[in-house]
């Protein structure tokens, strides 16, 4: 199957690095600078990324893979392959379209990036809260209040065993 | 423009090696992406060893294992050593950068 394929297109056989020169008979050349293809039968080979302003090089382009870029201090990557660089904030902030803004009460961000979150309502799980939360950390839940009351025990005794035979009293 | 010219080329026994060489005098040498192809009777002119623009020597397939790609910036000059050399290998070999191709210099393999 190899060599048919080849003999019915002569770019198949170009690899990773070159391309399928047109100009040239449809021979393969190799990617001229600052250019790659990292797969073989390519017809062109494509630009390297350049990773300028808020981004730099994580990774240098070559001939057979592209650049890869990550953002300078101060800001994270979005989006696939880092297409774009956020602002970070302080933990306890959230970014908007005016800047970094504080954590609205009631809700928390432990990170530089995303959006501040509700704390955690511990009586949805009937629990009580243990640690109240800030707007960098969320609350942390403790038992229930029932199980904190004066004499409450946490072990349930075991209910009396019935003898055989014998009807409740 | 860049004048190319190939030598080493001869008649060889199968197993045996060649080491051709690429003389290249006009533009920087170094920075270029220089290559070797290959074009036997009656067939299209292959790519067969090269330096990419970064510096990396790449093969084909046909020769991996058997053919070293090499350079001498100071000496200006361009080489492919062929060891294991097959029948197959027969060919006229051509030293290439961009636009400029060598006259070329002929390897034949046979017993």
């Known amino acids: 199957f190899e060599r048919t394929r080849s003999l019915q297109d002569p770019c198949s056989n170009c690899p990773a690095g070159t391309f399928c020169d047109n100009n040239r008979n449809q021979i393969c050349s190799p990617c001229p600078p600052n250019s790659f293809s990292s797969a073989g039968g390519q017809r062109t080979c494509d630009i390297c990324r350049q990773c300028k302003g808020v981004f730099r090089t994580r990774k240098e382009c070559s001939s057979t893979s592209n650049a890869e870029c990550d953002c300078t201090p101060g800001f994270h990557c979005l989006g696939a392959g880092c297409s774009m660089c956020e602002q970070d904030c302080k933990q306890g902030q959230e970014l908007t379209k005016k800047g970094c803004k504080d954590c609205c009460f009631g809700t928390f961000n432990d990170q530089k990036r995303g959006i501040c979150r509700p704390w955690t309502n511990c009586s949805l799980d009937g629990k009580s809260v243990l640690v109240n939360g800030t707007k960098e950390r969320d609350v942390v839940c403790g038992p229930s209040p029932a199980d904190l009351s004066p004499g409450a025990s946490s072990v349930t005794p075991p209910a009396p065993a019935r003898e055989p035979g014998h009807s409740p009293q | 423009a860049v004048q190319l010219v190939e030598s080493g080329g001869g008649l060889v026994q199968p197993g045996g090696s060649l080491r051709l060489s690429c003389a290249v005098s006009?533009?920087?040498?170094?920075?270029?992406?220089m290559s070797w192809y290959r074009q036997a009777p009656g067939k299209q002119r292959e790519l067969v060893a090269w330096?990419?623009?970064?510096?990396?020597?790449h093969y084909a397939d046909s020769a991996k294992g058997r053919f070293t790609i090499s350079r001498d910036n100071t000496k200006k000059t361009l080489y492919l050593q062929m060891n294991s050399l097959k029948l197959e290998d027969t060919a006229v070999y051509y030293c290439?950068?961009?636009?400029?191709w060598g006259p070329g210099t002929q390897v034949t393999v046979s017993s």
């Open positions: 290439n950068s961009g636009d400029s």
């Open positions: 330096f990419a623009w970064d510096n990396i020597a």
């Open positions: 006009g533009n920087i040498f170094s920075i270029r992406v």
